[in-house]
């Protein structure tokens, strides 16, 4: 559980707070809501920012919900339930004792169901695709530069290793990032691509979660990059699990924003 | 040297409120947490909740989210909490203790609710 | 919420014995335990910090051991002075919890 150490504070997340009785008398930092220690030389889990956010005083900004055909990230509006290791525990119940199963970003991917409901391992999501919309500009960006560009971003920003960008396509003005990481390919260590498009999402969004940076600021050789419709998929390693008449209508996790 | 100094023993009748202060010097009181504990009669140890005097971000226990104040006043370096619609199952010695892992402990405040 | 189990609930020993206590967490909880000595009318007192870190002025008889679920305070040579109550208390996330303690005795 590292911090700086000079005066205590966690560079990777700025829902914490820190103080000097870690082990070792070292800077420990905890996560706002679940209490638990994070490592501040990293990103912290989505889970454990996600209670964060539900812990954080009520006058933060609304969000409108997304369609209730979409399986959606509720982006916060749910206060999850994070194993140990502050990975979300497949199964999350709300004080109803309504239940649902979820993947390793959090998004539902069962019916609802009650307390008899079973999920039976936490289901990985190992590709995600960020699909963005850029503002008008004077004229399309270069593929390779703007490529070049994200892929620095996220190793550079989320310290995700770039192996698991597997590509950047354009055709202006939508922008599509694809993040892959299997369950074998995640070394101990390793950034989760679920935790970094989260970061990315709210770095996109103008709500950073980095302590003390401004926010992001993407430009592409000098040209501002201002993204004004953010669209993200996610697809598990085992595909989800709804009833037939849902499956009709729907054939990605989606997470919309405006 | 580190210290925390509790105020007095209290008397209270059932429904009535009660505050209690703990005082710290020998350190920087910004910079830790101060934890609430109370230990009833012939009982165990039980953690009420927690407060970082900086930014005054507090945490209860479920069981006294309803009823348990915690405040700080960092001019004073004191912590405060105040247990409301007191009952007899109240009565306890309440303590207050510093950092995660309670180093320092005040010497803890005999609260009687009794008609 | 993290349960802490403490076993035995009484201890029965004598002194220049060896005394060993138990902790038992709910859930994996790393090494965040912490061990306490409490006497009649005192405050507890911190004993051993993060499972094993000790702690100045606590005399070196007393260890701590464990991570993950299971957590060992040891006494290597009982003091007169050491019977008293002991306490787990773990630190992992909230809501803190204390284990129910043990009553350490002279036989």
């Known amino acids: 559980h590292t911090a700086a150490q000079d005066n205590c504070t966690c560079p990777t997340n700025k829902m914490t707070v820190c103080s000097p009785d870690g082990p070792g008398g070292r800077c420990q930092c905890r996560a706002l809501g679940s209490g638990m220690a994070v490592d501040c030389s990293t990103l912290t889990s989505k889970c454990l920012l996600l209670k964060a956010r539900m812990s954080a005083p009520k006058n933060a900004r609304t969000l409108v919900r997304p369609s209730e055909h979409a399986l959606v990230d509720n982006d916060g509006l749910y206060d999850p339930d994070c194993d140990p290791e502050g990975r979300f525990k497949a199964r999350q119940c709300n004080q109803t004792s309504v239940c649902w199963c979820v993947n390793s970003v959090g998004v539902r991917r069962t019916d609802k169901g009650d307390l008899s409901l079973r999920c039976d391992e936490l289901v990985r999501t190992h590709h995600i695709l960020i699909d963005l919309r850029h503002r008008p500009t004077a004229g399309a960006f270069n593929h390779s530069d703007l490529d070049a560009e994200l892929r620095r971003l996220f190793r550079e920003r989320y310290r995700l290793h770039p192996k698991f960008v597997a590509a950047v396509h354009y055709e202006q003005p939508t922008i599509q990032i694809e993040l892959r990481q299997n369950t074998s390919q995640k070394a101990a260590g390793d950034v989760d691509i679920g935790d970094a498009a989260y970061y990315f999402e709210r770095d996109i969004k103008g709500e950073s979660l980095f302590q003390g940076r401004g926010g992001l600021d993407l430009r592409v050789r000098g040209e501002p990059l201002q993204v004004e419709r953010t669209l993200i998929y996610y697809l598990d390693e085992i595909p989800p699990k709804f009833s037939m008449k849902r499956l009709t209508h729907h054939h990605h996790h989606h997470h919309h924003h405006h | 040297q580190v210290q925390l100094v509790q105020s007095g023993a209290e008397v209270k009748k059932p429904g009535a409120s009660v505050k209690v202060s703990c005082k710290a010097s020998?350190?920087?009181?910004?910079?830790?947490?101060i934890h609430w504990v109370r230990q009833a009669p012939g009982q165990g140890l039980e953690w009420i909740g927690t407060?970082?005097?900086?930014?005054?971000?507090?945490v209860y226990n479920q069981k006294f989210r309803d009823r348990a104040t915690m405040t700080a006043d960092r001019s004073i370096s004191t912590a405060y909490i105040e247990l409301s619609r007191l009952r007899s199952d109240d009565t306890a010695v309440y303590y207050c203790?510093?950092?995660?892992?309670?180093?320092?402990w005040g010497q803890g405040t005999t609260v009687t609710v009794s008609s | 919420e993290i349960v802490l189990t403490q076993s035995p609930a009484t201890l029965s020993l004598s002194p220049g014995e060896r005394a060993t206590l138990s902790c038992r967490a709910s859930?994996?909880?790393?090494?965040?335990i912490h061990w306490f000595q409490q006497k009649p009318g005192q405050s507890p007192r911190l004993l051993i910090k993060?499972?094993?870190e000790s702690i100045s002025g606590i005399p070196s008889r007393f260890s701590g051991s464990g991570s993950g679920t299971d957590f060992t305070l040891t006494i290597s040579s009982l003091e007169p002075e050491d019977f008293a109550v002991y306490y787990c208390?773990?630190?992992?996330?909230?809501?803190?919890?204390f284990g129910q303690g043990t009553k350490l005795e002279i036989k």
């Open positions: 203790a510093r950092a995660s892992y309670f180093d320092y």
């Open positions: 020998g350190y920087t009181f910004t910079t830790h947490w």
């Open positions: 407060i970082f005097p900086s930014n005054a971000y507090a």
């Open positions: 859930q994996n909880i790393g090494t965040s």
């Open positions: 993060y499972a094993s």
């Open positions: 208390q773990h630190s992992h996330s909230w809501p803190f919890t």
